[in-house]
């Protein structure tokens, strides 16, 4: 059956032979209506990439550099299955390219000029492409030929396989630049030995190299890693201090109509029948015909790449930056230490307009990028299409898991001038009901619920976390009869109460009328029994404070809070009647952009923050007529975090634990991708 056939692309006679064997053996173990293999032979991996894009083949396994080529237009391929190494219990699908130095040296990443460098080999990922790609814009001009620029940047190097005649400085630490193990400083162990012997000041290797060469922790403690933010960390902290995370070997397919489920079904069956130590007659991860045919011999199996993970996310910002710099050879005109405009990520149409207005008023210091959901915005910040946005704590958690860092906190209670340096305790997540109802925390089952959005703190993580510990399952749509929780599955009962309009029904952005704090409260006013919001929501939308038609006549006393002990209290008493304390919303950014974002925002709030009194004829950063566009409208200032500069420290142990528990019920494709 053609639609059940996976056309595998082979790049040599030997690969084609193995592919035919793969095809025949799979036929013998799979049912006739299951997936099948067909083989397509091409001259090179690049030809395979083009063939898949043109729908002449379906899959091929590629190294990281070729995954980059596959992702570029017009190919637009995406990773669908990853080879893993190590054990099934602790599968490794990535390695980390690191810069190792001796602990007793005193320079940082931005002080490598004039040092001596040790590389695994010319053109190799961890030893050359990544470090030189990331240093590219610091190299002296002209940057072509590249070897000459590198030779003039470092005071001496060992770059195995380089041309020692044309570029003698690249072979200064290993005469001849031998391209095999006859050169004692060749490859990973060799580059590390070059550092260890004192020949070089820095070695560009894999994170595992240090562990493979130094079994003793005391010996490893004599070395450190250079981080991109110009700090150092211990060699154990490679996940937080590396030049790039590099995928090892990956199966790619078309982004649209790519048969990824079929490819996974095929490879999953293949690893069951012909994986490591499974079969004598055919082995997926070895071959009598040659090394690394179709798949790496060192692979132990396959893992499905989460569907939300596109090639940009899979390869990572640092890796793509390095490879793009090397391939395109372009550098920004401004010096790299100068802050370029900050690209703010705006959610859908309304936020984009406010962001545009901010951009004009900032004289272009702020630029705007849009996405339809918060998760899409986070992904854009991760891959460099945007730089920053302000997030509810639930999304600060997801952003943190995706490698972003909190930069500034929204403060709601501290008056100026102390605001900028004050760390607030947070706000209260509350459950609001109509005073006329007889609801309590203990009889919510079967009622109609209103939520700010799935994944947000007050509207979801806190109430659903508490509910989960009571009902011990994730079927929240069965607990409530119906509700509006923007971001839920469209056919879920938790979208039934949403107002839309139609194509935007239940979307987690301002196009859905019941989205956010004000939207969830409106949902309660018009249709629901309980709304999960922040403690300020009722006062901010009653007594004529919200002029919209649905809100202008509402009275605060017509609403009450549900307390966890089964009682109810006035909305004026949130301190004594709340579900939990929630961390304030915070601005997040990539680590490399955090300082720029902080500096610019502190400057912007001095001009457009809460000191502006007349928002009807001036731009106000923290004002959008109860719509909470870009920032919460009740923000007094953006405050420095001081030492709360990681998502764990910012959110606090208790909240992180609560959200981690709720991950069993996670509907976040981005979180799944970021924890792959």
């Amino acid at each position: 059956v053609p639609e059940k056939s996976v056309r595998w692309c082979a790049v040599s006679e030997h690969e084609a032979t193995k592919c035919q064997s793969f095809r025949d053996h799979m036929k013998s173990v799979l049912p006739s209506n299951g997936p099948s293999v067909a083989c397509v032979k091409k001259a090179s991996h690049l030809d395979c990439i083009r063939a898949i894009a043109a729908n002449e083949a379906d899959a091929v396994t590629l190294d990281a550099g070729l995954v980059y080529d596959a992702y570029l237009a017009p190919n637009n391929l995406k990773p669908v299955v990853a080879e893993f190494y190590g054990s099934k219990e602790d599968p490794q699908t990535f390695y980390y390219a690191v810069a190792v130095v001796k602990k007793d040296s005193d320079f940082q990443m931005n002080q490598l000029r004039g040092r001596k460098s040790c590389h695994t080999g010319l053109g190799r990922s961890a030893g050359w492409n990544i470090p030189i790609g990331l240093l590219y814009c610091d190299l002296p001009e002209p940057r072509k030929p590249l070897e000459k620029a590198v030779a003039n940047f470092f005071s001496g190097s060992c770059v195995p396989c380089a041309d020692g005649t044309d570029f003698p400085q690249l072979c200064q630490l290993c005469p001849g630049c031998g391209c095999s193990t006859l050169n004692q400083y060749f490859s990973y162990s060799g580059a590390f030995k070059c550092l260890k012997d004192g020949a070089g000041d820095v070695a560009f290797v894999k994170h595992s190299t240090i562990f493979e060469n130094l079994a003793n922790k005391a010996d490893r403690d004599q070395y450190e890693l250079l981080c991109l933010d110009n700090t150092r960390k211990s060699v154990d902290e490679y996940k937080d201090c590396h030049l790039a995370r590099v995928p090892s070997h990956t199966v790619v397919a078309r982004s649209v109509g790519g048969k990824e489920d079929l490819i996974w079904e095929l490879l999953n069956q293949a690893q069951e029948h012909f994986g490591k130590d499974k079969s004598k007659e055919f082995q997926l991860f070895s071959s009598p015909h040659g090394k690394d045919l179709l798949f790496k011999d060192s692979a132990h199996g396959f893992l499905k790449v989460p569907p939300r993970m596109d090639a940009k996310m899979y390869l990572g910002y640092e890796y793509i930056t390095a490879i793009r710099n090397l391939r395109e050879g372009t550098c920004p005109e401004a010096p790299t230490d100068e802050c370029k405009p900050v690209k703010w990520c705006a959610l859908s149409h309304h936020e984009r307009l406010k962001c545009d207005e901010w951009s004009v008023n900032s004289a272009g210091k702020i630029e705007c990028e849009s996405a339809e959901t918060t998760e899409d915005c986070i992904a854009k910040i991760m891959n460099g299409e945007a730089d920053a946005m302000s997030l509810d704590g639930g999304f600060v958690y997801i952003a943190g898991m995706c490698g972003l860092v909190p930069v500034l906190a929204e403060n709601y209670n501290t008056p100026n001038p102390n605001c900028e340096n004050t760390a607030e305790e947070g706000y209260f997540a509350v459950a609001v009901v109509k005073s006329s109802s007889d609801l309590t925390w203990d009889n919510l089952k079967g009622k109609k619920s209103c939520h700010t959005a799935v994944g947000r703190t007050a509207g979801w993580n806190i109430p659903m976390g508490l509910l989960y510990s009571k009902i011990n399952h994730c079927r929240f749509d069965e607990f409530f009869s119906e509700g509006c929780a923007p971001g839920s599955e469209k056919n879920s009962s938790l979208c039934k109460l949403c107002m839309g309009p139609s194509p935007n029904l239940c979307e987690p952005n301002n196009k859905e009328g019941y989205y956010g704090y004000t939207g969830a409260f409106r949902c309660l006013v018009e249709k629901g029994d309980v709304a999960f919001v922040k403690h300020q929501t009722v006062p901010q939308n009653t007594g004529g404070k919200n002029p919209d038609a649905w809100a202008k006549n509402l009275k605060e006393e017509d609403y009450e809070l549900l307390c966890l002990d089964g009682s109810r209290k006035s909305v004026q008493e949130p301190a004594n009647c709340h579900l939990a304390r929630a961390p304030n919303h915070a601005v997040v950014a990539r680590k490399d952009k955090a300082d720029c974002v902080q500096t610019l925002l502190l400057d912007q709030q001095r001009m457009f923050g809460s000191s502006v009194t007349d928002c009807s004829s001036n731009f106000c950063l923290f004002e959008s007529k109860t719509k909470d566009l870009l920032f919460r409208d009740d923000t007094v200032c953006l405050a420095k975090l001081h030492d709360r500069n990681t998502y764990e420290k910012y959110l606090g142990e208790e909240y992180v634990k609560a959200v981690t528990n709720l991950r069993k019920c996670s509907t976040s494709p981005l979180l799944e991708a970021c924890t792959f």
């Epitope: 309304h350 936020e351 008023n361 009807s616 004829s617 731009f619 959008s624």
Partner: nanobody, 117 residues
């Protein structure tokens, strides 16, 4: 609420110039930032240029150096001088005052600009 009327569009050859005007009436005391947007068929509406009451301006990268935004506060009018026009500048051009546009969708009729030989 502010009413906005755009004018000045038309058909022009590549390399040519046009000057768009946008006249505001209604609660004009509330106008701070004004901007020109454009929307080409099948594309999202995008910011072309903006200007604050005090004259701070910003431009989309694709029009920098070719387009100039200005305003006459006495006449409550904002202008967009478009030089060195290119076929990719073809779109309906709208002006907005921002005072209400990001709460409700208040957009004028726009003015069509077509750049073609």
């Amino acid at each position: 609420q502010v009413q906005l009327v755009e004018s000045g569009g038309g058909l022009v050859q590549p390399g040519g110039s046009l000057r768009l005007s946008c006249a505001a009436s209604g609660s004009i005391f509330s106008i701070n930032t004004m901007a020109w947007y454009r929307q080409a068929p099948g594309k999202q509406r995008e910011l072309v240029a903006g200007i604050t009451r005090s004259g701070t301006t910003t431009y989309a990268g694709s029009v920098k150096g070719r387009f100039t935004i200005s305003r006459d506060n006495a006449k409550n009018t904002v202008y967009l001088q478009m030089n060195s026009l290119k076929p990719e500048d073809t779109a309906v051009y709208y002006c907005t005052d921002y005072s209400s546009s990001y709460y409700q969708d208040y957009w004028g009729q726009g003015t069509q600009v077509t750049v073609s030989s």
